[in-house]
Every structure is written in structure tokens, then in C-alpha cells.
Amino acid sequence: DLKVEMMAGGTQITPLNDNVTIFCNIFYSQPLNITSMGITWFWKSLTFDKEVKVFEFFGDHQEAFRPGAIVSPWRLKSGDASLRLPGIQLEEAGEYRCEVVVTPLKAQGTVQLEVVASPASRLLLDQVGMKENEDKYMCESSGFYPEAINITWEKQTQKFPHPIEISEDVITGPTIKNMDGTFNVTSCLKLNSSQEDPGTVYQCVVRHASLHTPLRSNFTLTAARHSLSETEKTDNFS
């Protein structure tokens, strides 16, 4: 009996430019003899419904149809037919199929590969054209993929125990596609500093599929109006 097992859940998520290993494990009732077996990896793009051969291994012959693609012969001996792809790109997302032949048996498994890019975030203060005591804070998120992103603004006063989401005077612009396929977006918060308590902490909070925890950039309203802080980076997808 020959069986192939892929990533549980049927989906693997990997960061852009990562050296990704797409998992494929072989289960066979007898010890594997790699000289009399074959492994072929196929890829089907998200945009075209056509399958392309990525890598093949037959006995003493192996060929990478995608530069750098490799299946380790040493690991194959113990049933690990995982495919390693260095420097994964956004356009390489899609369905990957691992086909194993141990004559006369054949088994296969598929997995969806999602390639994500984490946003970088920065806060800017724009006072051009603003009235006295009025400030416009811009939160720029750049270089993210996929396009879906959630940017919110929160404030935390000194006295109250938890933050509150700000919904008024917030404008989030359209996402803009970059040449490399990633996206940028800017969200703006308009503040009347004379109406706000000194010591209030404001945060731009970015939530994206590539982030385990939100990316936060904050500033504190001081008596001297404002002090921008560096982006507080939390751990990106790894």
C-alpha cells in the first residue's frame, strides 16, 4: 500500500522570498529503494488552469524545471519527498502536486501554497494646510500581499483601562499596486489636539494575513502637542 501525505489543512503559507519547503511524505509498506521509484512535482498557477512540471526524480536522474528546485535524495530514503524552492515569488503561489511512483503503485497529494508579504508601517505628521490645533497623522503601510488589509486607529487615555477604536475623522485610501505585485495603502487620522487630553496614546493598528500579531505605530499627545514613536514591530509571519 502506497500513500502520500501533504500539509495538514491542505494549505501552506510562506513569506515572499523565503526558501520554502513544500511537504510531501511517503508511506509505503516496505523499505523505499530510491533507484526504483519516481517523484514528480507539478504546479498549477492561480491564474492559468494549466499544470506545469516543476521537478522530477527517477532513479539516478533528477531535473529541476524551476531553477533551484530540489528534492533531497537522502531524505527520500526515509520517505520525505518534500520540494524545496529557494526565493519563492508571489506568482509562484498556487496548487502543488506531489506524484509518487513505486512500480506498479502510484499515489499523489496536493497542497495550496499561499505566498504572503508583510507590510511595513510608518507614521507621518502632515500639518500642511491644516488649521491651528488641527493635525493630520498618516499611517503608511507598504509592500504587503495579498491585498486584503485592515487598518484601524485606536486611542488610550490615561484614565481608562482599555483602548477604544476611533471611527470618526479617519479616511483610508485605496490600495495601490506596486510593480512587484505587492500593495501600499495610507490611512489618515485628523485630530484636534486642543480637544484631546495630554498623555493620550494614539495607535495605527495594521492587521494582515502575514502577521501573527498586529503591527502598531503610536504617538502620544503631549502638552507640546505630539511625539511620534517608532513603529512597534511585532513578530512577522515566520
Partner: antibody, heavy 117, light 107 residues
Framework: QVQLVQSGAEVKKPGASVKVSCKAS????????MNWMKQAPGQGLEWIGG????????DYNEKFKGKVTMTVDTSTSTVYMELSSLRSEDTAVYYC??????????WGQGTLVTVSS | DIQMTQSPSSLSASVGDRVTITCKAS??????VAWYQQKPGKAPKSLIY???NRYDAVPSRFSGSGSGTDFTLTISSLQPEDFATYFC?????????FGAGTKLEIK
């Protein structure tokens, strides 16, 4: 990191007073507001009051006015809550709490005050 | 003072179950509602703020919803460590007030 360390458990007789302390570390002490909460055995939570750590102002729940006094010693970054004229219904765990960050607000470990004759 | 009425007061469920706890405010509190989890002998731990935002270390199985007067905490798939007491809290104004709590027990 932020830590709020409270004084140990107390056993008091009815009519006595008790002073519970909460020592803060890991942040700029005076720029925060500290709240105190009460949790009677098997009960929910009640807000007792709060104090600006610069010592500027206090705000007490009407229910606890005359019962509680909050003070600050900025030199030791410690907040105190004194409960007077203790009765059996004052038996509870008392918590000091501070506004949080993006992992939530900060709480002391709690101080059990038992009022028993 | 704003009253926070929480229901049910206790609830028995099994690992893997979906559980919903509700909280009703006596007046409009906007989205100024937080949810806490408390285990015996421990201080409460914040889960949700601003009605629906999860604090960063909180697992995604916890979610909050609602605004105005009606609020809900949902645990999508109960884990063994989720058996505890849950409280809602309004923080739109002082005095801060809490719900009476919902004790979540293993069925």
C-alpha cells in the same frame, strides 16, 4: 516589563483599618492612573476608585466614599489603599490595576483581606 | 451607574464546543466594552477591548461583537484551558462596572 506587586494577606478585626500597598515597576510611575478593584469571595468585580499617580487627583465610587482613602508615595512608586471601619462584608481580594498596552491591562496579584472577630 | 447584565451565570460545555456569553448594558456604552477571563485564585486577564478587538496574545478562537447595549463573547472551539469565569466590563464612564460573571464548566 510592567509589574504591580501587592502586599500580603491581612486578617483584621471588625472596626479596625487596613492599608494595602501596590508597588509598581517597569514604567514611568507618575504618568498613570491606578484603579483598585474589590472581589468578594465567589463574587464579581467592583471598582472602588482610582488615583493619578502624580498624586493630583482621586476618584472614588460613591459606594466606597468614607470607607476608602487612596494615597501615593512617588519616591517608592507605591500606591496605598486604606480601608477603615472594617466589617465582615469587606472580606475580599483587592486588586490594583493599571491601564494596559496591547496585551491588556495590568493587575496586581491581589491581596486577601479577611475581617473576622 | 451603568448596569452590566451578563448571561448565563453558568454554562456547561465540552471541549470543541462553540460557546456564546452575552452582556447587556443598561444604557448606550458605544463600543467601550472589555471582556476578561478569570481562573480560580488568579487576577482577571484581558481578552477583548473596544467590544471586538482581541488583545495581541489572545487566541483567535475568542471573538467579541456588539455595540450600544448588546454585547457577545464567543469561543469558537473550546479548549481545556478555557474553562474559567468570564466577565464583561464597561469603560465609557466611571464608575467602571462589571457583569456578574459567567462560570464556564466542563460538561
Amino acid at each position: 516589563q510592567v509589574q504591580l506587586v501587592q502586599s500580603g494577606a491581612e486578617v483584621k478585626k471588625p472596626g479596625a483599618s487596613v492599608k494595602v500597598s501596590c508597588k509598581a515597576s517597569g514604567y514611568t510611575f507618575t504618568s498613570y492612573w491606578m484603579n483598585w478593584m474589590k472581589q468578594a469571595p465567589g463574587q464579581g468585580l467592583e471598582w472602588i476608585g482610582g488615583i493619578y499617580l502624580s498624586g493630583e487627583s482621586t476618584d472614588y465610587n460613591e459606594k466606597f466614599k468614607g470607607k476608602v482613602t487612596m494615597t501615593v508615595d512617588t519616591s517608592t512608586s507605591t500606591v496605598y489603599m486604606e480601608l477603615s471601619s472594617l466589617r465582615s462584608e469587606d472580606t475580599a481580594v483587592y486588586y490594583c490595576t493599571r491601564r494596559g498596552d496591547y496585551f491588556g491591562d495590568f493587575w496586581g496579584q491581589g491581596t486577601l483581606v479577611t475581617v473576622s472577630s | 451607574d451603568i448596569q452590566m447584565t451578563q448571561s448565563p451565570s453558568s454554562l456547561s460545555a465540552s471541549v470543541g464546543d462553540r460557546v456564546t456569553i452575552t452582556c447587556k448594558a443598561s444604557q448606550n456604552v458605544g463600543k467601550y466594552v472589555a471582556w476578561y477571563q478569570q481562573k480560580p485564585g488568579k487576577a482577571p486577564k484581558s481578552l477583548i477591548y473596544s467590544a471586538s478587538n482581541r488583545y495581541d496574545a489572545v487566541p483567535s478562537r475568542f471573538s467579541g461583537s456588539g455595540s450600544g447595549t448588546d454585547f457577545t463573547l464567543t469561543i469558537s472551539s473550546l479548549q481545556p484551558e478555557d474553562f474559567a469565569t468570564y466577565f464583561c466590563q464597561q469603560y465609557i464612564s466611571y464608575p467602571l462596572t462589571f457583569g456578574a460573571g459567567t462560570k464556564l464548566e466542563i460538561k
